[in-house]
């Protein structure tokens, strides 16, 4: 015998108190699939959470975070404090990156500057708390008598002779 509840569409529930008739979900609740015997309570986006999508009879509300915070976890289950660039979030709040490290985002950890010498290159631009170092040509390329670094010639389009 077919379950009469299987005919109840999303947005309704199978009401046992009313001979298994399909009743609409009450306010502030939803059912996202058919054949449900109860509707789920809508998520409330309170406090630091703000409503990205309102709850409907067939889908839950979706939250994100108020400015100054960012989402963490599945479905934005948490809001974590943003820091400034050049900082990282610690147990005691936002702290400046230590010398030799940087963070160019409002979240995440401070990362060590690139070690240019590992690639046989020199430091072209020093690092800061907010920016990584910029590596330049290798020291050998900069030694006296070495040819200066010149940009490559632009590629010529076919069929065009040089000016």
């Amino acid at each position: 015998l077919q379950d009469p509840c299987s005919n109840c569409p999303a947005g309704t529930f199978c009401d046992n108190n009313r001979n298994q008739i399909c009743s609409p979900c009450p306010p502030n609740s939803f059912s996202s699939a058919g054949g449900q015997r109860t509707c789920d309570i809508c998520r409330q986006c309170k406090g630091v959470f703000r409503t990205r999508k309102e709850c409907s009879s067939t889908s839950n509300a979706e939250c994100d975070c108020t400015p100054g915070f960012h989402c963490l976890g599945a479905g934005c289950s948490m809001c974590e404090q943003d820091c400034k660039q050049g900082q990282e979030l610690t147990k005691k709040g936002c702290k400046d990156c230590c010398f030799g490290t940087f963070n160019d985002q409002k979240r995440g950890i401070c990362r060590p500057w690139t070690n240019c010498s590992l690639d046989g290159k020199s430091v072209l631009v020093n690092g800061t708390k907010e920016r990584d170092v910029v590596c330049g040509p290798s020291p050998a390329d900069l030694s006296p008598g070495a040819s200066s670094v010149t940009p490559p010639a632009p590629a010529r389009e076919p069929g065009h002779s040089p000016q």
Epitope: R43, V48, F69, L72, M78, C79, Q81, K91, K92, G93
Partner: nanobody, 121 residues
């Protein structure tokens, strides 16, 4: 049951002071941080200040540094937001929340309903 209740709001002239209270009940107050947020008409909600369970302060808004301070009285299960040199742009509904940690809020944290602060001459 769990409750957070804000009080102390009202109408104050520019340059004046107010002290808001956030009274908690129904949970182990000492284990939780308390954060203050505010929402001005037609604007996004913004974080103001937070106090950790151990008493350390975290400023969320640079605009209140030097004017607002936060303290807690664990014996009274209450956190206080002392606001001085108030400006018209501080006008908002102020509400408190109780996360475990000032830097991270969960969707099941407790929140109050808010208290209105109006700064106007």
């Amino acid at each position: 049951q769990v409750q957070l209740q804000e009080s102390g709001g009202g109408l104050v002239q520019p340059g004046g002071s107010l002290r808001l209270s956030c009274a908690a009940s129904g949970f182990t107050f000492d284990d939780y941080a308390i954060g203050w947020f505010r929402q001005a008409p037609g604007k996004e909600r913004e974080g103001v200040l937070c106090i950790s369970s151990s008493g350390g302060s975290t400023y969320y808004a640079d605009s209140v540094k030097g004017r607002f301070t936060i303290s807690r009285d664990n014996a009274k299960n209450t956190v206080y937001l002392q606001m001085t040199n108030l400006k018209p742009e501080d006008t908002a509904v102020y509400l408190c929340g109780a996360p475990r940690d000032c830097s991270r809020y969960s969707s099941d944290d407790y929140w109050g309903q808010g208290t209105q602060v109006t700064v106007s001459s």
